[in-house]
């Protein structure tokens, strides 16, 4: 659809005569009839297949034609067409004399014709005017013409209909050739697909308007490139949705079981060395001078009774010092200046001479010890506490403080590791010499049956079109992560490509 426009510029008829040569009375009141038709090698009479138009009287004899496009569109003359412009045409322009006011063909005598010109040729659609001048014996006509497309029609022959729009069926303007030019932020054949936020993950994100990034199930973050870990995951991460891969030192289904109590809690005091020995379990190796489960107790070096022969022990900053009784000397009062004649043996001990009387030895009755039978027997010296238990003197008796995992008077009994019900998900616990073993029910595995291997919802390969399947462990269901171009809960639907333009 378009318009053939003809702009009449000047008509010269100096002698004011008709085509017959007869003069007009009083002058030639001139109007024009225009016939536009298909291309003819020799322009001949016949139907004006592309249209006709007539002007009112524009002047007398010779005159210039005013541009009157604003005042009703009389000049340029408009010859609209509702077909594809063929690129060629024939044009007939007749100048007529109007003796009266009736300009209808049937109201005019045939000899009222002043001049007739006929041209034909090629004409491309465009904004530029073609200027032409046709001269006959008595008249001259100067005019210009062009073909332009009607509103919303585009292309070389005005055949492409395109209407700019900015709604959900398209966001575009029209290019000169009729193709669409998408508005900023939109793409697709009809410019109806928004361009998501730059960097928005192609598979895991989408958008409904430009510069947006909405996440598909299992993904989060500004660009939908961060997976959502399994619900309840405490000290773990994921590389695909609903995973819970434990950080170092953590275990269990939700990574909430502390396997590195030493690092996370630093329980050992006074520079002791900490060793992890199981979930929330540890052992402290104390530095000299310290004791207790967490090495929190400072040991007196005199507690080991290092002074012999009744010497008294004094604690010092850098150790201890023995004050020896008369007749003894040495670091631990171990050297004697006494003999049996001095009755050195206490508590009923009997004395025996040694080295020709230069030395002696005391034989102590039960419950006494020491080189002079001066000490009551320390019931802990025989290390009666098994399995690393700590022996404590309590007057005439003794008791053992046991390490975790042991019990009994002498810590000789191994506490059942199974007592804490360590096996998850109904696993059966077996005590072993060095720990325990869990026998897991169907669907669970791991040292403590903490790994769910039950219904792998992805085992049946429910996702189509090479989608990635993730098992949601909390619900035993699956989530399909679709590749680009597919949607649906199983990625079973291709995102349809719209058909081509219906030109």
């Amino acid at each position: 659809s378009g318009v053939f426009q003809l702009q009449l510029q000047e008509f010269i008829n100096e002698r004011g005569v008709l085509a017959s040569g007869r003069p007009c009375e009083p002058g030639c009141r001139t109007f024009f009839r225009v016939c536009l038709k298909h291309f003819q090698a020799v322009v001949s009479p016949g139907p004006c297949t592309f249209g006709t138009v007539s002007t009112p009287v524009l002047g007398t004899n010779s005159f210039a034609v005013r541009d009157d496009s604003s005042g009703g569109g009389r000049n340029p003359l408009q010859l609209p067409f509702n077909f594809t412009w063929p690129g060629t045409f024939s044009l007939i322009i007749e100048a007529w004399h109007a003796p009266g006011d009736d300009l209808r063909p049937e109201a005019l005598p045939p000899d009222a014709l002043i001049s007739k010109i006929a041209i034909q040729g090629s004409l491309a659609v465009g904004q530029n005017w073609l200027l032409d001048e046709q001269t006959s014996t008595l008249t001259r006509l100067r005019y210009s013409y062009r073909v332009i497309c009607s509103d919303n029609y585009y292309g070389d022959n005005c055949s492409r209909l395109c209407k700019k729009r900015n709604d959900h069926f398209g966001h575009y303007v029209c290019q000169p050739d009729g193709n669409l030019s998408c508005l900023p932020g939109w793409t697709g054949e009809y410019c109806q697909q928004p361009i998501c936020l730059s960097g928005c993950h192609e598979q895991n994100g989408y958008c409904s308007k430009p510069a947006e990034c909405l996440c598909r199930p299992g993904w989060q973050g500004r660009l939908c490139n961060e997976c959502i870990p399994h619900n309840g995951c405490r000290h773990g991460t994921c590389s695909t949705p609903w995973q819970c891969t434990c950080d170092e030192g953590w275990g269990g289904l939700f990574c909430d079981q502390d396997l590195n109590y030493c690092t996370h809690h630093s329980p050992c005091k006074n520079g002791a060395t900490c060793s992890n020995s199981g979930q929330r379990s540890y052992t402290c190796t104390c530095r000299p001078g310290y004791t207790g489960v967490d090495c929190e107790l400072e040991l007196s070096e005199c507690d080991s009774n290092p002074c012999r022969n009744g010497g008294s022990c004094k604690d010092q900053e850098d150790g201890y010092h023995c004050l020896c009784p008369p007749g003894y000397y040495g670091l631990h009062c171990e050297h004697s200046t006494l003999s049996c004649a001095d009755s050195p043996c206490f508590n009923g001990g009997s004395c025996r001479e040694r080295n020709q009387g230069a030395n002696y030895a005391c034989e102590c009755p039960p419950n006494f010890t020491g080189s002079n039978c001066e000490k009551k027997v320390d019931r802990c010296t025989s290390n009666p506490c098994a399995n690393g238990g700590q022996c404590l003197n309590r007057g005439p008796s003794r008791m053992c403080r046991c390490r975790p995992g042991f019990t009994g008077t002498y810590c000789e009994l191994h506490v059942s590791d199974c007592a804490r019900n360590p096996c998850a998900h109904g696993g059966t616990c077996h005590d072993l010499e060095n720990g325990l073993m869990c026998t897991c029910p169907a669907g669970f595995s791991g040292r403590r049956c903490e790994v769910r291997t039950s219904i792998d919802a992805c085992a049946s390969s429910p996702c189509f079109n090479r989608a990635t399947c993730y098992t949601d462990l909390s619900t035993d269901t699956f989530v399909c992560n679709c590749p680009y171009g597919f949607v649906g809960s199983r990625c079973e639907f291709p995102v349809g490509l719209p058909p081509s333009f219906p030109w």
């Epitope: 509103d151 919303n152 209909l161 209407k163 700019k164 729009r165 900015n166 709604d167 959900h168 069926f169 398209g170 697709g188 054949e189 009809y190 109806q192 697909q193 989408y206 958008c207 409904s208 308007k209 949607v487 649906g488 639907f493 291709p494 995102v495 349809g496 490509l497 719209p498 058909p499 333009f501 219906p502």
Partner: antibody, heavy 121, light 104 residues
């Protein structure tokens, strides 16, 4: 060939919510080439566009109904739904679901057979 | 709100041409669709984007749109063409239907 089928109660009490579902068969609702719309026609009167939605859930509503209407999509079931709240007798109409094609400038090339919803106590 | 106006009825003799108009402000700058609806049936798209016919629609149906008026023309009208006809356009994000024309 794509087919659309409306379903839902034929009688709704005044002030309640009208709920209809359109099931799409013979084609995927998850195509960027189409919007899925609801149109109604009161007895003996003309057509009125209610609103539409695409597979991603972008919705557009008739301003005259916007405060009362909600359209949603379920791509896994290949369905889309209409909810119209606070209904009155004026909402009595045949309700159609239709497919609006982007390539046809928004023309609705497939329609359901329509379901009559009467609002009455 | 945007409105599309249609004549309530148009009468035509079989074999003659029926023209149904649809007018709206600057309608020529919008794409117009036309729907045919027979009694008790769902509407059927007969023209889209002003002038295009969907497959299966007879050639006797044609459309045009310029200025403020779109026209649906049925040339060589047949008895089976008796129906209600609705024009439809999009104003911003809203679908707008004409009031409908009964062709007898």
């Amino acid at each position: 060939e794509v087919q659309l089928q409306e379903s839902g109660p034929g009688l709704v009490k005044p002030s309640e919510t009208l709920s209809l579902t359109c099931t799409v068969s013979g084609g995927s609702i998850s195509s960027s080439s189409y919007y899925w719309g609801w149109i109604r026609q009161p007895p003996g009167k003309g057509l009125e566009w209610i609103g539409d939605i695409n597979y991603a859930g972008s919705t557009y509503y008739n301003p005259s109904l916007k405060n009362r209407v909600t359209i949603s999509v379920d791509t896994s079931k290949n369905q889309f739904s209409l909810k119209l709240s606070s209904v009155t007798a004026a909402d009595t109409a045949v309700y159609y679901c239709a497919r609006e094609a982007v390539a046809l400038g928004g023309g609705a090339d497939s329609w359901g057979q329509g379901t009559l919803v009467t609002v009455s106590s | 709100s945007y409105e599309l106006t249609q004549p309530p009825s148009v009468s035509v003799s079989p074999g003659q041409t029926a023209s149904i108009t649809c007018s709206g402000d600057m309608l020529g700058d919008k794409y117009v669709s036309w729907y045919q609806q027979k009694p008790g049936q769902s509407p059927v798209l007969v023209i889209y984007e002003d002038t295009n016919r969907p497959s299966g629609i007879p050639e006797r149906f044609s459309g045009s749109n310029s200025g403020d008026t779109a026209t649906l023309t049925i040339s060589g009208t047949q008895a089976m063409d008796e129906a209600d006809y609705y024009c439809q356009a999009w104003d911003s994000e809203t679908g707008v239907f004409g009031s409908g024309t009964k062709v007898t």
